[in-house]
């Protein structure tokens, strides 16, 4: 079958490239108990049916037990994300058992062969868990399987095969090829654990989607829409290299799921929140920043168990690096009237001023056309905590819909040089903070002067808490 063009094309080639691997027999899966944060510490290999290594390695039967499951590999050596995740788990849960599932012999294969091996690896993990359950004090409820890429589906198989129910499975950008649209018993699914949470960071609706697009857990979180991750663009990744490959971009976006999870472990004081939404476009419009009825949740390790709904899709924006947290705001701008607008589509820019800090000038992303005499909703986010918002500066520019319209504008201007300027009339801006759920209304500083021309500034000051009229009360919202 033809491979797609673009970044995925080269990776598609990699997926099907034969590899000469000298393996006489297929060895069993190994379970390496990481007894130290030190990456050079060998750890201990657990052996099914042999209790002595459990004692020798200090396996804590009553503590949480994490199983980290890697994915497909082209190198046959553990990538550094695994080292970071082991270290972060040890830092956060000092008494926990951290077990690295080493299935490199079965993963260092053609991608298609590695996929076919996921079932047998899942079965091996399930057998290990069944054996551990025979021990006093060991509880399956304390088991958390963390699978990256192909490893997420291995975790699904393990959860499916084990006698009983695993406490939690976290899927870190579960693999897409050969799993997209598959039957629930042939991929990670909500049935595989008491709580299944998933981070999707490399999904594509065109070409090859390295990560699975469909929701496969109780909650499925799509940072930055689940596709283009900040800091992973060609300029970001290749710009800093003397020589670079497109594979670096793919790796950056796919692996971002792991780093978001690590961030949630080590930056507990800076939790990132995701918000339930039916799709990415609605989220980009800023209409999904509600925390009512479990509609928002922390991401990664701090996610709260939500089993009431299946396949709850959640979205958030992030920074380009750790800590990934940003502060989301919904902005409702009522455009009362256009004046001499022609075919010009306005682009808004806001600067937010708060008690802690001021934002940069932020563009308001237009998902749909700006409606006249209607309330337009936008999503904005800042990397720093601004504190309580005090005022907003608004500007706009006209972006022509086409070269033809631009020419029409120019011709109109040349024929009527004294044509009155284009103006928008905006009297107030309503703001809702995603993180605090607080609603505020900002009114034009000069109520008599609410028209704004391109490039000019309009200032808005906080005029009331909430969005309702003064005689109405606003219900309080409990954050999760």
């Amino acid at each position: 079958s033809p491979t797609p063009f673009g970044p995925e094309g080269q990776l598609a080639d990699e997926l099907h490239k034969p590899k000469a691997i000298q393996t006489e027999v297929k060895p069993s899966v190994r379970f390496n108990l990481r007894t130290s944060k030190d990456p050079e510490h060998e750890g201990c290999y657990l052996s099914l049916g042999h209790s002595q290594p459990l004692e020798d390695c200090g396996f804590n039967m009553t503590a949480k037990t994490f199983f980290i499951i890697h994915g497909w590999t082209m190198s046959g050596i553990f990538e550094n994300w695994l080292h970071k995740l082991v270290s972060a788990l040890h830092t956060r849960e000092k008494d926990a058992n951290v077990v690295v599932v080493d299935w490199l012999p079965l993963a260092h294969q053609l991608y298609t062969d590695a996929v076919n091996n996921t079932r047998v690896v899942g079965h091996s993990i399930a057998r290990m868990l069944d054996w551990l359950q025979e021990k006093d004090d060991f509880s399956l409820g304390n088991v958390h399987l963390i699978g990256y890429s192909l490893g997420a589906h291995v975790a699904g198989y393990a959860g499916n095969f084990v006698k009983g129910t695993v406490g939690r499975i976290t899927g870190l950008d579960p693999a897409g090829p050969m799993f997209e649209g598959a039957d629930i018993h042939k991929r990670l699914s909500p049935d595989d654990a008491d709580f299944v949470d998933v981070l999707h960071t490399y999904t594509r609706s065109f070409g090859l989607s390295i990560g699975i697009q469909m929701p496969v857990g109780h909650i499925d979180i799509y940072p930055n829409g689940g596709d283009f991750q900040p800091g992973c663009g060609l300029n970001d990744v290749l710009g800093s290299m003397a020589y670079g490959t497109i594979t670096e971009v793919v790796k950056c976006e796919h692996e971002r799921a792991v780093h978001l999870f690590v961030d949630s472990l080590v930056n507990q004081d800076k939790p990132s929140f995701a918000f339930q939404c039916t799709d990415s476009n609605r989220f980009k419009k800023g209409i999904c920043l509600s925390c009512r009825k479990n509609r928002c949740n922390s991401i990664g390790y701090n996610a709260k168990k939500m089993r009431n709904k299946r396949n709850s899709k959640m979205y958030l924006k992030t920074r380009a690096g750790m800590p990934f947290r940003v502060y989301h705001y919904q902005m409702k701008i009522h455009v009362f009237s256009y004046k001499n607008m022609g075919e010009i589509e306005p682009t808004f820019y806001v600067t937010l001023y708060g008690t802690n800090a001021d934002s940069q000038t932020l563009p308001l992303e237009i998902v749909e056309r700006i409606e006249q005499n209607a309330t337009n909703t936008f999503l904005v986010y800042t990397e720093e905590d601004l504190g309580d918002l005090l005022k907003i500066q608004l500007t706009w520019e006209g972006a022509s819909q086409s070269w033809y319209n631009l020419w029409k504008e120019l011709r109109s201007y040349l024929s009527q040089p004294h044509n009155p300027g284009r103006e928008l009339n905006i009297r107030r801006i309503r703001v809702k903070s995603g993180e605090t759920q607080r609603k505020l209304t900002f009114c034009a500083e000069d109520p008599e002067n609410t028209s704004i021309s391109p490039g000019r500034e309009l200032w808005f000051r906080k005029c009331r808490d909430g969005w309702r009229m003064k005689n109405e009360t606003s219900p309080t919202v409990e954050l999760p």
């Epitope: 691997i21 060895p27 990456p39 190198s75 490199l104």
Partner: antibody, heavy 120, light 107 residues
Framework: QVQLVQSGAEVKKPGASVKVSCKAS????????IHWVRQAPGQGLEWMGH????????NNNEKFKDRVTMTRDTSISTAYMELSRLRSDDTAVYYC?????????????WGQGTTVTVSS | DIQMTQSPSSLSASVGDRVTITCRAS??????LNWYQQKPGKAPKLLIS???KLHSGVPSRFSGSGSGTDFTLTISSLQPEDFATYYC?????????FGQGTKLEIK
């Protein structure tokens, strides 16, 4: 204590092949990866590739493409590196080195080196 | 491939001197930087891993620092046995690459 002992010096003609061995002791052979690094006379160090002795999976530096073959024999805790189609610029000291299970792990123990001279 | 550039290529110093060798990577290597010492006719020896972690048996006069793309190896008070060639190596991305080396000679 950890030790990596390599085979003796070799003199080869251009176009021939050379096979260098590296015997490990003092640790569990299958718990670490074995890497091959070479050093041309008066030059720096160049990574050639590695083998995971646990199952024999290898990964080579693209520079050596199909010329390098790495194998191992777990029964005698020995890793091998064969370089084919030798050229005069392959004259170098070839080292095996032990590395932990991560990319980031350092080469913590090295063999004494095997001098390979390619000359007609 | 990630390029590792060491400076200086060579330097002369006296016993008791404080010496600094720098290593620059062509991209961020997430602190996955190791330092080795090599004496003529011998195999390299690990000094420091993960930017600053001293390998067992290595004297405390050796120290490492840095982040992102710029790293430093410091010898606080040179001893006669420290005259050798020093190499940095990145462990962030395959293929693993080394600096070209810094030869430390007696003044």
């Amino acid at each position: 204590q950890v030790q990596l002992v390599q085979s003796g010096a070799e003199v080869k003609k251009p176009g021939a092949s050379v096979k260098v061995s590296c015997k490990a002791s003092g640790y569990t052979f299958t718990d670490n990866t074995i890497h091959w690094v070479r050093q041309a006379p008066g030059q720096g160090l160049e990574w050639m590739g590695h083998i995971n002795p646990y199952y024999g999976g290898t990964n080579n530096n693209e520079k050596f493409k199909d010329r390098v073959t790495m194998t191992r024999d777990t029964s005698i805790s020995t890793a091998y590196m064969e370089l084919s189609r030798l050229r005069s610029d392959d004259t170098a000291v070839y080292y095996c080195a032990r590395k932990g299970i991560y990319y980031s792990s350092p080469f913590d123990y090295w063999g004494q080196g095997t001098t390979v001279t390619v000359s007609s | 491939d990630i390029q590792m550039t060491q400076s200086p290529s060579s330097l002369s110093a006296s016993v008791g001197d404080r010496v600094t060798i720098t290593c620059r990577a062509s991209q961020d290597i997430n602190n996955y930087l190791n330092w080795y010492q090599q004496k003529p006719g011998k195999a390299p020896k690990l000094l420091i891993s993960y930017t600053s972690k001293l390998h067992s048996g290595v004297p405390s006069r050796f120290s490492g620092s840095g982040s992102g793309t710029d790293f430093t190896l410091t010898i606080s008070s040179l001893q006669p046995e420290d005259f050798a060639t020093y190499y940095c190596q990145q462990g962030n991305t395959l293929p693993f690459t080394f600096g070209q080396g810094t030869k430390l000679e007696i003044k």
